[in-house]
């Protein structure tokens, strides 16, 4: 019995087609992805093949102005239109709190939303009961397939799930649910979830009875043969894991941002064993036309976005200096504002011993592309922020050793004075440079804000200690020459859209007046 699994993950609000790098579409003839194009391909496959499932492995939420404005209603509407069969909860589905998940998505979705390792307690338990499920049995042709969901147990550190949701260990939570499916005579089981490729592989290895793993969170690109675009494969598609009980379990993921549609064909025998598995992600490029009815719907929903981008978010009573003459040479108040917003967006009081789990921010000065003049009645709009942060990136959470941070700050000034983008703006860090010294030895003082303290204060950086840092995804991926971050990072979780982080902070503060205050000397 042959099953076709179509899958997406980490779409992050890319409802409209995007450029090849998943930023805003500029030249339509070269654009990719988007739900209208995705629908064309999905329908084409549904017409050609008998047993098809369309699955999403989480993180539909967060990433563009679509989410900022529609807050998840757009996800429910367009996923319903595409007739998704199931979705797993990702960490970003909790970005607007549990209410921001329940009302726009859980109550509106016409497909099951899954996670076996999230358990509700207290008053929330009855409110959320039945709105998401640990598993769902889906009829597919003459057969049935069980789908079990899972979500990163790091979600409380990455998003805002509140105190009434407990995130259990994925493997511990999945096993009893899979066992339950087996007792219901369901012998074809897909684990669909959002914990990253390493955990996907562990689930394939450790959870008895799981036949296929469809994952997300790590934006992993897998491909067999010559890849069709710029993404470099982390392995073959599907990636085969040998389980502890001796079965070959295919593991798949489909990069991110709706650029690809994962396409996996599985042949099962009567016992539910995977006899064969093959496929590849399908690049959703301009050779695939956008479906006209979905496209028309997108255009209708688009109108509200254009109105939103000119509305006032808050006010500044000072000039926000985002000029390259400042931000690439010295501490600039736009850099301070952005870093303060980044830390504020990551406030998570999950442990009495820590005032927060992260206190530090670094930001490449070259990523700040425009100032904002306060003499326009102090008004700040989304449009203004889009000029400051035009690249559509995210502000991510990483874990780095102190020694890596030291290297990063040396790199920040290794060719100081040439107006290059690698000069770092900071938050929760005090750095002192001596530019008379030779490159690679210019950082003379590096103090960082404590986290395991009730009164935050600055302590010298320890080389062997592991620190959490918020930074742009551009830096996490080694951009501007920060190869040491990419090579030495111990953990990397993608965060929220850069503009959204700053806009939320400005809306919260209402009036802002960031200063230059001696963070960099």
């Amino acid at each position: 019995w042959e099953l076709t699994i179509l899958h997406t993950n980490d779409v992050h609000s890319r409802l409209e087609q995007t450029s090849e790098d998943s930023s805003k579409c500029v030249n339509a003839s070269r654009c990719m992805g988007g739900v209208a194009r995705l629908f064309t391909k999905v329908q084409q496959i549904r017409r050609a093949e008998p047993n098809v499932l369309l699955l999403d492995a989480g993180d539909q939420y967060q990433g563009t102005i679509w989410f900022t404005v529609y807050k998840g209603a757009e996800v429910a509407h367009f996923m319903n239109a595409l007739r998704y069969d199931a979705m797993a909860l990702g960490n970003h589905e909790f970005d607007n709190g549990v209410e921001g998940l329940i009302e726009p998505l859980l109550k509106e979705a016409k497909f099951p939303i899954l996670s076996a390792n999230i358990k509700a307690k207290g008053p929330l338990a009855s409110q959320i009961s039945g709105l998401y499920l640990p598993y769902k049995v889906l009829p597919v042709g003459d057969e049935v397939v069980g789908i079990v969901g899972y979500t990163s147990k790091e979600t409380p550190f990455l998003s805002n799930p509140g105190t009434n949701l407990v995130f259990e260990d994925e493997i511990t939570a999945l096993q009893p649910e899979v066992d339950k499916l087996k007792t219901l005579n369901v012998n074809k089981i897909i684990a669909l979830g959002h914990s990253g490729f390493e955990m996907d592989k562990l689930i394939a290895q450790k959870v008895r009875g799981v036949d296929v793993v469809v994952g997300g969170h790590s934006n992993t690109f897998l491909y067999t043969g010559n890849p069709p675009s710029k993404e470099v494969p982390a392995g073959k598609y599907p990636f085969i894991v040998t389980s502890d009980d001796g079965r070959k379990v295919p593991v798949v993921q489909a990069y991110a941002f709706g650029k690809y549609l994962g396409y996996l064909k599985i042949e099962f025998d009567e016992r539910g064993n995977v006899i064969s598995s093959h496929g590849n992600p399908i690049l959703l490029n301009s050779s695939i036309p956008e479906d006209p009815s979905i496209k028309a719907d997108i255009n209708k929903w688009r109108i509200k976005l254009d109105n939103y981008s000119t509305q006032e978010l808050g006010k500044t009573i000072v000039y926000l200096d985002g000029s390259s003459q400042s931000c690439r040479f010295r501490e600039c108040n736009m850099g301070n504002l952005i870093c303060d917003a980044m830390i504020n967006n990551n406030l998570r009081h999950t442990d009495e011993m820590f005032w927060n789990h992260v206190s530090m921010c670094i930001l490449n000065g070259g990523g700040i592309r425009s100032p904002i003049d306060e003499r326009n009645n102090g008004t700040i709009t989304w449009e203004n922020l889009a000029a400051v942060l035009p690249f559509g990136g995210t502000f991510d959470l990483v874990q780095l050793k102190g020694s890596t941070l030291k290297k990063a700050f040396e790199h920040s000034v290794h060719r100081y004075g040439q107006s290059t983008g690698e000069f770092l703006q900071v938050g929760g860090i005090h750095v002192v440079y001596d530019l008379s010294r030779k490159p690679g030895d210019r950082v003379v003082k590096l103090d960082v804000l404590c986290t395991k303290c009730r009164v935050p204060s600055y302590d010298p950086l320890k080389m062997d200690e592991v620190y959490k840092v918020i930074l742009p995804n551009f830096l996490a991926n080694g951009g501007d020459g920060f190869q040491m971050i990419k090579d030495e990072l111990l953990r990397h979780d993608s965060g929220d859209q850069d503009i959204n982080v700053v806009s939320t902070y400005i809306s919260k503060m209402k009036v802002i007046y960031p200063a230059v205050e001696g963070r960099i000397k």
Epitope: D142, E143, D269, S276
Partner: antibody
């Protein structure tokens, strides 16, 4: 649990036909196919062909094409293998086996003797 | 047709021995290979499917490996109940074909 139950032993004369049945249970019958395999005394196994339960599509080994016919009765989840123009070398145990031979019938002994 | 050459045709071994049986296909069969066990009395049982996946209930002392046209069944420590005849089966293309069998006997 998958189960395949075959009909009983048959003794046939050369030139006659035999029809062996295989009744399946414990799975969604229409979603799969059935294989037929023969084993002559003291010999290895030999694949005869397969039939898709849903629409009756068949594949045969060249050796058995024209002499073997596989049919299906969906209402009773039963598959049949008919072998015509029997000769002494057709004396063997005939097995039905699921799609990828994960489960086997108990075998039906067919003896061709004058 | 794809020919499956199985070796050895028979072997004598003692309990606890490591036993290796090989199957060579006349062309690449890309992982489409099963291993079957036939006990005296005729009952057939699949041990390994898709080259290396172990059927449920099959002891972990059985393992399969290989690629292309060369495949191996290994019994890491032979047990009394393992004395039987073993067959490989390729299902890469029609007609499906079996190896000639390997009879594992008590030394």
């Amino acid at each position: 649990e998958v189960q395949l139950v075959q009909s009983g032993a048959e003794v046939k004369k050369p030139g006659a036909s035999v029809k062996v049945s295989c009744k399946a249970s414990g799975y969604t019958f229409t979603a799969y196919f059935m294989n037929w395999v023969m084993q002559a005394p003291g010999q290895s196994l030999e694949w005869i062909g397969r039939i898709y339960h849903n629409n009756g599509d068949t594949f045969y080994s060249q050796k058995f094409k024209g002499r073997a016919t596989l049919t299906v009765d969906k209402s009773t989840s039963t598959v049949y293998m008919e072998l015509r123009s029997l000769r002494s070398e057709d004396t063997a145990v005939y097995y039905c086996a699921t799609s990828y031979v994960g489960d086997w019938g108990q075998g039906t002994t067919v003896t061709v003797s004058s | 047709d794809i020919q499956m050459t199985q070796s050895p045709s028979s072997l004598s071994a003692s309990v606890g021995d490591r036993v290796t049986i090989t199957c060579r296909a006349s062309q690449d069969i890309g992982d489409s290979l099963n291993w079957l066990q036939q006990k005296p009395g005729g009952a057939l049982k699949r041990l390994i499917y898709a080259t290396s996946s172990l059927d449920s209930g099959v002891p972990s002392r059985f393992s399969g490996s290989g690629s292309g046209s060369d495949y191996t069944l290994t019994i890491s420590s032979l047990q009394p109940e393992d004395f039987a005849t073993y067959y490989c089966l390729q299902y890469a293309s029609f007609p499906w074909t079996f190896g000639g069998g390997t009879k594992v006997e008590i030394k």
